[in-house]
């Protein structure tokens, strides 16, 4: 990569030196690499503490990964004239702990946003909607990647992390056009009830590597476009009839359920019956029981009703302390 203070089509990526003159529309910011031909700016692993102000107007793909941004304020990418071409923004691993309302305003073409691997102690409810109106202007976002954004325990706010993320996803119904949502590795214990209802265009939902114990209060009913549902590596014990019926009713879906601690007792009977006849579960013959101990490693598909018993509950008079 060559170093220069103004862009040149001869070098595919240009590392910029600081310049005394006012920034030109196509200048490359200090500590960044730019390619006008690829419409790409990379400011990667440079310990930046704020978003460069002098981003070139041609930027379509902006990588700001591996920095130390800490806070993303309102209008962090607002410029005059606006960055009208910016379509993909990657902020992963940049030590963000706060994303404020309107942080992504004035980016009319922003289709893909990746905030993964940032310990977000505070995510404003209006981070993606830009305003606190009950119905906001639709966000242009199509893909939102929020893997491993859970902060360490000592940095968590009093409110639930799940609730904070959910509020940002549903605010102003701004994300109705979202096709892809990744929420893997966030220690989610539950999925707030109303989130999926506000995301009717979802095609791909990744909730893998969380701590979801149950989907009883989650409705997938209106996700008629859903193609992939990733629930691997959670703490799911069983899927109940309501969930099974909803999943079966989705016309295009493929569900991934590997590595959950399935409890193979009498409550599992409906799920086993469903697994035997459904085509929606990928790799279903690799689902195995984790509990009770006598059933560990048994393949769910090979169980029958006689295998699935529950220990009788003793009446109180017969229970011992």
């Amino acid at each position: 990569t060559s170093s220069a203070s103004s862009s040149s089509s001869s070098a595919p990526f240009l590392a910029s030196a600081a310049s005394a003159q006012p920034p030109l529309p196509d200048q490359c910011p200090a500590l960044c690499e730019c390619s006008e031909a690829a419409r790409t700016v990379k400011c990667v692993n440079r310990n930046l503490t704020e978003v460069p102000t002098d981003l070139p107007l041609y930027v379509r793909n902006l990588f700001l990964t591996g920095n130390q941004l800490a806070v993303l304020p309102a209008g962090a990418f607002a410029r005059r004239p606006p960055l009208a071409e910016l379509a993909a923004l990657n902020l992963s691993g940049s030590r963000l702990d706060e994303v404020r309302g309107g942080a992504f305003e004035h980016l009319p073409s922003l289709r893909q946003l990746d905030l993964s691997h940032n310990p977000l102690a505070y995510l404003s409810p209006f981070a993606f909607s830009g305003s606190n109106a009950s119905i906001s202007a639709p966000s242009p976002l199509v893909e939102l990647i929020l893997n491993h954004i859970v902060p360490p325990d000592d940095k968590r706010q009093n409110r639930s992390f799940e609730g904070m993320v959910a509020a940002a996803l549903v605010a102003g119904r701004a994300l109705q056009g979202l096709h892809l949502l990744e929420l893997a590795s966030n220690h989610f214990l539950y999925l707030p009830r109303d989130v999926l209802a506000q995301l009717p265009s979802l095609r791909y939902l990744d909730l893998s590597n969380n701590s979801l114990v149950s989907l009883t209060y989650v409705s997938f009913r209106n996700l008629t476009h859903l193609e992939s549902l990733h629930l691997e590596d959670n703490a799911l014990k069983v899927l109940h009839n309501g969930t099974l019926a909803e999943l079966q009713g989705l016309p295009h879906v493929r569900v991934f359920l590997d590595n959950n601690p399935w409890v193979c007792d009498c409550h599992m009977a409906d799920m086993v019956t469903w697994l035997k006849q459904t085509g929606v579960v990928q790799g279903k013959d690799r689902l195995t029981c984790a509990f009770p101990e006598k059933m560990r490693n048994r393949v769910l598909l090979e169980l029958n009703s006689a295998d699935l018993d529950c220990d009788p509950i003793l009446p109180p008079s017969l229970q011992t302390s």
């Epitope: 590795s185 590597n209 590596d233 590595n259 013959d285 690799r286 195995t288 984790a290 560990r296 490693n297 048994r298 393949v299 598909l301 090979e302 169980l303």
Partner: antibody
């Protein structure tokens, strides 16, 4: 109690094929995956692949595709592993194990020696 | 493939010692880790599954712990019959992979 009994030692020539067996007793044979693991002298353990006897479903380590073929006979509760086009590198102890999320019971191993 | 590394290939300890054997994964494996014991005669046994659950019949002096990429097996009070090679194994993703093994010997 759960037991996996493997066939006896084999001495084979390079280029030949061999079929090792693993007979399961003491549990519902069709309800668990059977795993195969290779151990060359002085080396660690290497997963070859697995088969679910009741369905014939199998998964292989990419490294052993074309080398190992797993089959099952539910009438005799036996799983077989055929190794083809043998070379010196195939000389090893081969273990079967009852699988799933862990390999909770293992066979005693079959020693395969490939020598001209 | 996920690489499993047991940095200590051999370990010498005295009877009664507390011994810890380490294992690290090339990426996070979310506690999807098992430990096996292979005796000098070739017999292999499961000791610990899912990081810390003791398999039935395994003495309580064995315990497992860890998270993310780093895991360990501890023998709290070494006995003569514990002389063996110990292997860790990840089961989060096919192909299942094992560590290179740690051979435990008596001083």
């Amino acid at each position: 109690q759960v037991q996996l009994r493997q066939s006896g030692a084999e001495l084979m020539k390079p280029g030949a094929s061999v079929k090792l067996s693993c007979k399961a007793t003491g549990y519902t044979f069709t309800g668990y995956w059977i795993e195969w693991v290779k151990q060359r002298p002085g080396h660690g353990l290497e997963w070859i692949g697995e088969i679910l006897p009741g369905r014939g479903s199998s998964n292989y380590n990419e490294k052993f595709k074309g080398k190992a073929t797993l089959t099952a006979d539910t009438s005799s509760n036996t799983v077989y592993m055929q190794l083809s086009s043998l070379t010196i590198e195939d000389s090893a102890i081969y273990y079967c194990a009852r699988g799933g999320r862990d390999f909770d019971y293992w066979g005693q191993g079959t020693t395969l020696t490939v020598s001209s | 493939d996920i690489q499993m590394t047991q940095i200590t290939s051999s370990l010498s300890a005295s009877l009664g010692d507390r011994v810890t054997i380490g294992c690290s994964a090339s990426q996070g494996i979310n506690n999807n880790l098992n430990w096996y014991q292979q005796k000098p005669d070739g017999t292999v046994k499961l000791l610990v599954y899912y990081t810390s659950s003791l398999h039935s019949g395994v003495p309580s002096r064995f315990s497992g712990s860890g998270s993310g990429t780093d895991y360990s097996l501890t023998i709290s009070n070494l006995e003569p019959e514990d002389i063996a090679t110990y292997y860790c194994q990840q089961f989060i993703k096919l192909p299942y992979t094992f560590g290179g093994g740690t051979k435990l010997e008596i001083k």
